[in-house]
Interface confidence: medium
């Protein structure tokens, strides 16, 4: 039986639906009751979808596949794959059995366009001709890995002193960070191009650097000294302010928020316009307050991964910057207490008491005490495991030898929130008979 599939890979954008074409030539008198159709992953042989005994047997692949039932009788065995993910990339085999048997494999090539690159400079103030500057070009959420090119204002490729890293996120999409180190001339334009080799999609950005010939007074940028504490899932405001001079207009303002350590762009306001969030679309400025010198940043739906230092750069004619720390926190749940063994307990028995508290941040401090308020420090083992969101589950185990009876309390303290969660258990040992 001849089974036909396209020779070229099917290219599908992440999040869209893809059709993996497969066809066969039914003989006269063919009925669907005769058809056995199986789609499977070519390499692992994992079942994806099947049609047997005259019936669509449904999706075995995360409920994201479908056949074209109205077209099967005409020999169309194509498979619809919904909401394509990076992990779907690969070869799918279409097996068709009527009386005879045939199969063919079709390749799925997944792709995602890269964002317009953001450009950051380090250092970014008091630049003079002859200074070495590091220019970082960052582009996000593309697939597959990008090709990155740099060039100067005359279109000359820059290949020396370029370091490019590409990191895949949980969805398999790549964030590209390319760093160019250059020695400044009188002034210069540097451009970075991020090319998606599958989509032949180009995303590029430029930065023009005009070094100062003489030092000027810096803009005074003010941020809070203490870290901003934000609960996971809530919104946080990273305060930053500057003092605008008389006659100041937003057209003069360049405002950049970036991660202090990695120089990743978070949000920017340039050329009189809010350039939007470059940070998972979870940041916003306060546009109505900018003209009064309020350059604060709103960070929405705070995650553990947001914790760290954010730098607020303000450039008008002069330049200034300051860093504000974000401390993320999440309260711990009321501890649950378990005993092992938990029956037929007698004075003198050794018992293990486990105190468990969940989904807190940062790591907890754990304390035990007995019914008289005496701290228990010996024979305590505490483990803290972070989940995918970075939140900690705490399990603390106390081993004690029972007296006639006793109360044992465990306290789980969040050191940032100064939040205490405690649980206790009272054990009454049965007398010896």
């Amino acid at each position: 039986l001849e089974v036909q599939v396209p020779e070229d890979p099917v290219v599908a954008l992440v999040g869209t639906d893809a059709t993996l074409c497969c066809s066969f030539s039914p003989e006269p008198g063919f009925s669907l009751a005769q058809l056995n159709l199986i789609w499977q992953l070519t390499d692992t042989k994992q079942l994806v979808h099947s049609f047997a005994e005259g019936q669509d047997q449904g999706s075995a692949y995360a409920n994201r596949t479908a056949l074209f039932p109205d077209l099967l009788a005409q020999g169309n065995a194509s498979l619809r794959l919904q909401r394509v993910r990076v992990a779907d990339e690969g070869s799918f085999t279409c097996f068709v059995s009527i009386r005879d048997f045939g199969s063919a494999a079709v390749s799925l090539q997944v792709a995602a366009p890269y964002s317009k690159p953001s450009m950051t400079l380090e250092p970014n103030k008091d630049l003079r001709p002859g200074d070495t500057v590091t220019i970082t070009c960052s582009s996000y959420q593309g697939y597959p890995e990008a090709e990155v090119f740099w060039q100067d204002g005359q279109g000359v490729p820059l290949t020396g002193n370029v370091t490019t890293s590409q990191m895949a996120n949980e969805q398999g999409l790549f964030d590209v960070h390319s760093i160019l180190r250059v020695v400044l001339g009188a002034n210069g334009t540097y451009s970075c191009l991020v090319r998606n080799p599958v989509l032949q999609q180009d995303a590029h950005s430029s930065v023009t650097i005009t070094p100062q010939r003489s030092p000027t007074g810096a803009v005074e940028v003010q941020v809070p000294e203490d870290p901003v504490v934000a609960l996971v899932g809530t919104d946080a405001t990273l305060r930053c302010s500057f003092s605008p001079e008389p006659g100041f207009s937003l057209a003069q303002l360049n405002l950049i928020w970036q991660l202090t350590d990695t120089k990743q762009l978070v949000h920017s306001f340039t050329e009189g316009r809010d350039q939007g969030s470059a940070y998972a679309n979870r940041t916003a400025l306060f546009p109505d307050l900018l003209a009064q010198g309020n350059a604060s940043l709103r960070l929405q739906r705070v995650r553990v991964a947001d914790e760290g230092s954010f730098t607020c750069f303000v450039s008008i004619r002069d330049f200034g910057s300051a860093a504000v720390s974000l401390q993320v926190a999440a309260p711990y749940s009321k501890p649950s207490m378990t005993l092992e063994p938990n029956k037929d307990l007698r004075p003198g028995d050794t018992v293990t008491i486990t105190c468990s508290s969940y989904r807190g941040y940062p790591e907890a401090e754990v304390f035990w005490q007995d019914g008289q308020g005496v701290p228990l420090t010996g024979n305590v083992t505490t483990s803290q495991m972070a989940n995918e969101q970075g939140l900690f589950d705490v399990h603390s185990v106390l081993r004690v030898v029972l007296g006639a009876n006793g109360t044992y309390s465990c306290l789980v303290r969040n050191p940032v929130l100064q939040q205490d969660a405690h649980g206790s258990v009272t054990i009454t040992g049965q007398p010896m008979t």
């Epitope: 090709e147 090119f149 005359q154 000359v156 290949t159 191009l193």
Partner: antibody, heavy 121, light 106 residues
Framework: EVQLVQSGAEVKKPGASVKVSCKAS????????MHWVRQAPGQGLEWMGG????????TYNQKFKGRVTMTRDTSISTAYMELSRLRSEDTAVYYC??????????????WGQGTTVTVSS | DIQLTQSPSSLSASVGDRVTMTCSAS?????MHWYQQKPGKAPKLLIY???KLASGVPSRFSGSGSGTDFTLTISSLQPEDFATYYC?????????FGGGTKVEIK
């Protein structure tokens, strides 16, 4: 129609200078970088450098640095290449060539007809 | 500098022949571009970015390759294809051309 029209042939003595012009038409002159390439008789192509008409910024092949000067006059959409201290091995056809439109197109999509420069005593 | 070596330096072929020429770079390049030049004329862009056909160029011309080895193929040689073909790179400065492959009538 996009065209690059170059000035006529030149005969020069060793030690002299030559200035070749290249007039662009059919497109916006300042949107494309202009380069110069030469070809000695019976030889291959040799890149000399380029000029960004928008900024006047230049890039030169090290081999010609100090002898070549590229300029432009945006008012008449014309690029110039001047080569000084000529020697007999500079005898060649000199071409202006337009770099591809995209900032990252590293090839030449339109060429002038060429200007023959002969250096002879 | 990146040196580009074209081979063969010349070849003889008949109309209708399939013709292949290569360009070898002394170190890896991102893209290769190809030009055709006829005697007394300026070069003409044929293939850019390794495999893309320039505007107005017949589909019998194709390019391929990556890294250091690139190929220009003419699937069925026509009378107007007898010319010299040059490869060019600008992945690193300075921009360089190959020495050329001259395609002559057999």
């Amino acid at each position: 129609e996009v065209q690059l029209v170059q000035s006529g042939a030149e005969v020069k003595k060793p030690g002299a200078s030559v200035k070749v012009s290249c007039k662009a038409s059919g497109y916006t002159f300042t949107e494309y970088i202009m380069h110069w390439v030469r070809q000695a008789p019976g030889q291959g192509l040799e890149w000399m450098g380029g000029i960004n008409p928008a900024s006047g910024g230049t890039t030169y092949n090290q081999k010609f640095k100090g002898r070549v000067t590229m300029t432009r006059d945006t008012s008449i959409s014309t690029a110039y290449m001047e080569l000084s201290r000529l020697r007999s091995e500079d005898t060649a056809v000199y071409y202006c060539a337009r770099k591809g439109k995209d900032y990252f197109d590293w090839y030449f999509d339109v060429w002038g007809q060429g200007t023959t420069v002969t250096v002879s005593s | 500098d990146i040196q580009l070596t074209q081979s063969p330096s010349s070849l003889s072929a008949s109309v209708g022949d399939r013709v292949t020429m290569t360009c070898s770079a002394s170190s890896s390049v991102s893209y290769m571009h190809w030009y055709q030049q006829k005697p007394g004329k300026a070069p003409k862009l044929l293939i850019y970015d390794t495999s893309k056909l320039a505007s107005g160029v017949p589909s019998r011309f194709s390019g391929s390759g990556s890294g250091t080895d690139f190929t220009l193929t003419i699937s069925s040689l026509q009378p107007e294809d007898f010319a010299t073909y040059y490869c060019q790179q600008w992945s690193a400065s300075p921009l360089t051309f190959g020495g050329g492959t001259k395609v002559e009538i057999k």
